[in-house]
């Protein structure tokens, strides 16, 4: 859980000829305020589309009116923050919707009269618990500057919210695979326990006791393989039941990218790729120059010195798209260790791992043989998240604490009787043979195939093997 | 701190041959996963278990190897296209005491002509 928080800080007119009329004048005074919703992943940005995030309204701002003959300034703006609380994780990718009403004071009847003055949109990434990012948005003529950020409510923490801080149990450290909360130095990650039966290679969770399922996958324990080969298309919602993909409309049909933009699909929704010049989600916005400062995430402008000739973000490394919008995918280098599910949250990578493992880049195998101990001088042998105790003669078992029985796989040859001896075992040979498990016979002149036995042991007398 | 120096690069014809290199130094670091990208997408690489990985689109064509410090990587690239011209990025999952860090190269011009 936590709070994505707003800043609005000016509202106005923007850079550039054709300055907009101002919204209120002195016969119809008004004031603003604004709303925004917010949508996780790569949704679409419709503004009838449920804000599945959560969204807020500001309160009002001054009383505005128009001093005439002077050009529209920066409008005054409500005081405070839009604050949207969220109950579960911070997906680090969101959607936004942003808009400026205006609330007309004049003589209406009925009371006052509302009207939507600018409306921006946007998707972009967020790691919670990290600095306030900055942003500047047009909408025609109008320009919105805001700030905003995602904090955690304790006791989660993390770039999601999804570790849980408590207090240490031990003073000195954290138990297995735990690390200490920071900035929380005192206090501890504390181990997230999904939905008992919750599959842990198809399976995993955000918050205690949910169990979400890796794509591919369905059931409530994600267990439950999604298969195609009976349906329709390959698109569309998963059924629970069925394990069965329904068809359904694709995101790019009809082609919602304008101005030349391409459109590909992505696991929740679509996204455009857009030529030189435009951006925004559907390649809406255009007439863009390097002085507008179209390049995100300190990317370089060329070029672009007028609204007619196409500007290029040379982007940082790290950062991809026209506009240096999209992050780069870390996680395609498979950073994780022994099967862990990457994550990548913008400003951390980080990685789910399979039962067994632990630490951050699932590195340490949980079950390996720190710490544990073969009995009765037998070793250790690591492999695969598991450990086996390679057992001495004469036992066996998981941890080798469990006599075995050494005539139980019926070592002796040729009808020998086997006796379980201290040291190992014995076999008493048939008539005929001879050896530590009568695997040799005594030829019919008296002489064996081995070497004379011992002083004192004539053939078919018991051979103690060990 | 850790450095990732790349050299090579540089302008060939199509169907030649290109070398890219790519170095980290620092202390007290060790290498989790490193490998290329280029326009945003992983070209090649070693992940985070050691296995190398490849791009579809050069698949066959390009070739990573690790040096015996194991903090190097170069991609060998043959049968060039044009359409490998691009800036081709060195990255490194690196572990620094006991956290992890991302790190970039600052970056090669590969150009292919037809």
């Known amino acids: 859980a936590g709070v994505f928080e707003l800043q609005i800080h000016s509202f106005g007119p923007g850079p550039g000829p054709g300055a907009p009329r101002s919204p209120c004048s002195a016969r119809l005074p008004c004031r603003l305020f604004f709303r925004v919703c917010l949508k996780p992943g790569l949704s679409e940005e419709a503004a009838e589309s449920p804000c599945a995030l959560g969204a807020a309204l500001s309160a009002r701002g001054p009383v505005y009116t128009e001093q005439p003959g002077a050009p529209a300034p920066d409008l005054p703006l409500p005081d405070g923050l839009l604050q949207v609380p969220f109950r579960d994780a911070w997906p680090g990718t969101f959607s936004f919707i942003i808009e400026t009403w205006r609330e007309e004071l004049g003589d209406q009847i009925g009371g006052p009269a509302w009207s939507l003055l600018a409306r921006v949109a946007g998707r972009r990434r967020l790691a919670a618990g990290g600095p306030w990012a900055r942003d500047i948005q047009r909408a025609g003529a109008w320009e919105l500057r805001f700030s905003y950020r995602a904090r955690c409510e304790p006791p989660a923490v993390g770039t999601a919210c999804t570790r849980l801080c408590r207090p240490r149990s031990a003073p000195s450290r954290c138990g297995p695979g735990l690390r200490p909360c920071a900035p929380l130095e005192d206090e501890c990650e504390a181990p997230l326990v999904c939905r008992a039966g919750c599959s842990p290679e198809h399976g995993f969770c955000e918050q205690p006791g949910e169990c979400r399922c890796l794509e591919g996958w369905t059931g409530p324990l994600c267990t439950v393989p999604v298969s195609t080969s009976s349906c329709l298309s390959p698109r569309g919602p998963s059924s629970a039941t069925t394990g069965c993909l329904v068809p359904g409309p694709g995101p790019c049909d009809g082609n919602p990218c304008a101005n030349g933009g391409s459109c590909s699909e992505t696991p929740r929704s679509f996204e455009c790729t857009c030529p030189r010049g435009f951006y925004g989600l559907r390649c809406e916005v255009s007439g863009v120059t390097c002085a507008d400062g179209p390049c995100f995430n300190g990317g370089l402008c060329v070029g672009g010195a007028d609204p007619d000739s196409a500007y290029i973000c040379h982007c940082p490394p790290g950062f991809q798209g026209s506009n240096c919008e999209k992050r780069v995918d870390r996680c395609s280098l498979q950073p994780c260790r022994n099967g862990g599910l990457c994550l990548d949250l913008g400003h951390a990578l980080r990685c789910r791992c399979r039962a067994g493992f632990a630490g951050p880049r699932c590195e340490h195998d949980l079950d390996d043989c720190a710490g544990r101990a073969c009995a009765n001088g037998g070793t250790c042998v690591e492999g695969g998240g598991a450990h086996r105790c390679s057992c001495a003669l004469g036992f066996g078992g998981r941890d080798c604490r469990e006599r075995a029985d050494p005539c139980a796989a019926r070592p002796c040859a040729h009808g020998g009787r086997c006796y379980a001896h201290f040291s190992g075992l014995v076999c008493a040979c048939a008539p005929g043979y001879m050896g530590a498990r009568c695997e040799f016979p005594v030829h019919p002149d008296g002489a064996s195939a081995l070497p004379a036995a011992p002083p004192g042991l004539r053939p078919g007398d018991p051979q103690r093997y060990l | 701190q850790v450095q990732l120096q790349q050299s090579g690069g540089g302008l060939v014809q199509a169907g030649g041959s290109l070398r890219l290199s790519c170095a980290a130094s620092?202390?007290?670091?060790?290498?989790?996963?490193m490998g290329w990208y280029r326009q945003g997408e992983l070209v090649a690489g070693f992940t985070g278990d050691g296995n190398p990985i490849y791009a579809d689109s050069v698949k066959g064509r390009f070739t990573i190897s690790r040096g015996n410090a194991e903090n190097t990587v170069s991609l060998q690239m043959n049968s060039l296209k044009p359409e490998d011209t691009a800036v081709y990025y060195c990255?490194?999952?690196?572990?620094?005491?006991?956290?992890?860090?991302?790190?970039w190269g600052q970056g090669t011009q590969v150009t292919v002509k037809p």
């Open positions: 990255a490194a999952d690196v572990k620094i005491g006991g956290d992890y860090e991302w790190y």
């Open positions: 620092g202390s007290d670091f060790s290498i989790n996963a």
